[in-house]
Amino acid sequence: TLNSVLNSNAIKNLPPPLGGAAGHPGSAVSAAPGILYPGGNKYQTIDNYQPYPCAEDEECGTDEYCASPTRGGDAGVQICLACRKRRKRCMRHAMCCPGNYCKNGICVSSDQNNFRGEIEETITESFGNDHSTLDGYSRRTTLSSKMYHSKGQEGSVCLRSSDCATGLCCARHFWSKICKPVLKEGQVCTKHRRKGSHGLEIFQRCYCGEGLSCRIQKDHHQASNSSRLHTCQRH
């Protein structure tokens, strides 16, 4: 089981997470709570930043949190603000950028409590044994060579989204990574939540399709945190 993997320290010095091309700003998946994968549906530059009204951190993008734009401002007016980088002041985990968490009022790297390393080792140990070797980014030849001549169909194993056919992305599922359908309008999606206290989630959903973003369902604003539902909605 995965628990035994959590105790393994066999794999060190990992490359970027499997499934995201090196240097790409975001992974191809809508990662679930606790996973330190950058990426999501709302990568925005400061230039074209549009304030997005919010009530909860979960309504904001991966690299944002929900707060009043002015210190001591009207608590009723909140927007999605850019996350705080390492060593910046914070009041809660969600204020810190992915890969960091709030400790004693300061955003610190998740590396410092071994959280990131533990997760990455777990993923590679349990999902990666059949995947890539860790020197450079070269692949072991255990994957069927056929896979790379024809694009992977739904459910077939993959290393990254480019291995999958059109309309599919490469995402974690059970102990492996497989080609899954890109999400359509109305389908449930996962918002990244950077709270380090969350357990390791080993299911990933693809991102929302073109013209869609992952937003909280309007009728779920009053729902409890645990049942808050996000779906792919038109921009």
Epitope: L2, D130, L143, E154, G155, S156, V157, E201
Partner: antibody
Framework: QVQLVESGGGLVQPGGSLRLSCAAS????????MSWVRQAPGKGLEWVSG????????HYADSVKGRFTISRDNSKNTLYLQMNSLRAEDTAVYYC?????????WGQGTLVTVSS | DIALTQPASVSGSPGQSITISCTGT?????????VSWYQQHPGKAPKLMIH???NRPSGVSNRFSGSKSGNTASLTISGLQAEDEADYYC??????????FGGGTKLTVLG
């Protein structure tokens, strides 16, 4: 179309061994994880074991750990389950299932009866 | 053992809607936010009906829908038909025991 056909079931005495096979066709077998799931007569489903597409990664339910071994031969498109030290409670229909988006295709199953 | 709890039986008349519940613990249904549903007719192999809580594989009727709230997942079948009579199993994945199946629910279509 995807097809999974199990074989190798039968009557065996407690403590005995049996090897189940599952012949796969209609898809690229070597690109999918595979699983065995069993169902005791009149009971619910119980996941038994899973194996990665190359065979280098295996998982087992606690109830069969150390007694059952899952393996595969990608050149023959065949999945196997070697069952040793069989017990009466292992009596069940054993299904082979493809692990795509969950257990998305199942065989019709083969009955294993452990009785003296 | 971690278990998913389903009602032993549910019944409904043709055309009606029925819902089958599946209750788990925070480490499975609630924690992982991932549930699948399988249909099994007597003497037949199970068939995947819903994955990821609410997604239907191709070929599955849109009369079948899934949802989840907290630690309870639900399968709803609308416009009940005679051929829907079968056993239904929910399933999730747990970090300590891998796959977990519910005990199953026998659906009877009356009349």
């Amino acid at each position: 179309q995807v097809q999974l056909v199990e074989s190798g079931g039968g009557l065996v005495q407690p403590g005995g061994s049996l090897r189940l096979s599952c012949a796969a066709s209609g898809f690229t077998f070597s690109s999918y994880w595979m699983s065995w799931v069993r169902q005791a007569p009149g009971k619910g489903l119980e996941w038994v074991s899973g194996i990665s597409y190359s065979g280098s990664n295996t998982h087992y339910a606690d109830s069969v750990k150390g007694r059952f071994t899952i393996s595969r031969d990608n050149s023959k498109n065949t999945l196997y389950l070697q069952m040793n030290s069989l017990r009466a409670e292992d009596t069940a229909v054993y299904y082979c299932a493809r692990m795509g988006i969950d257990l998305d295709y199942w065989g019709q199953g083969t009955l294993v009866t452990v009785s003296s | 053992d971690i278990a998913l709890t389903q009602p032993a039986s549910v019944s409904g008349s043709p055309g009606q809607s029925i819902t089958i519940s599946c209750t788990g613990t925070s480490s499975d249904v609630g924690g992982f936010n991932y549930v699948s549903w399988y249909q099994q007719h007597p003497g037949k192999a199970p068939k995947l009906m819903i994955h990821d809580g609410s997604n239907r594989p191709s070929g599955v009727s849109n009369r079948f829908s899934g949802s989840k709230s907290g630690n309870t997942a639900s399968l709803t079948i609308s416009g009940l038909q005679a051929e829907d009579e079968a056993d239904y199993y929910c399933s999730t994945w747990d970090m300590t025991v891998d796959f977990v199946f519910g005990g199953g629910t026998k659906l009877t279509v009356l009349g």
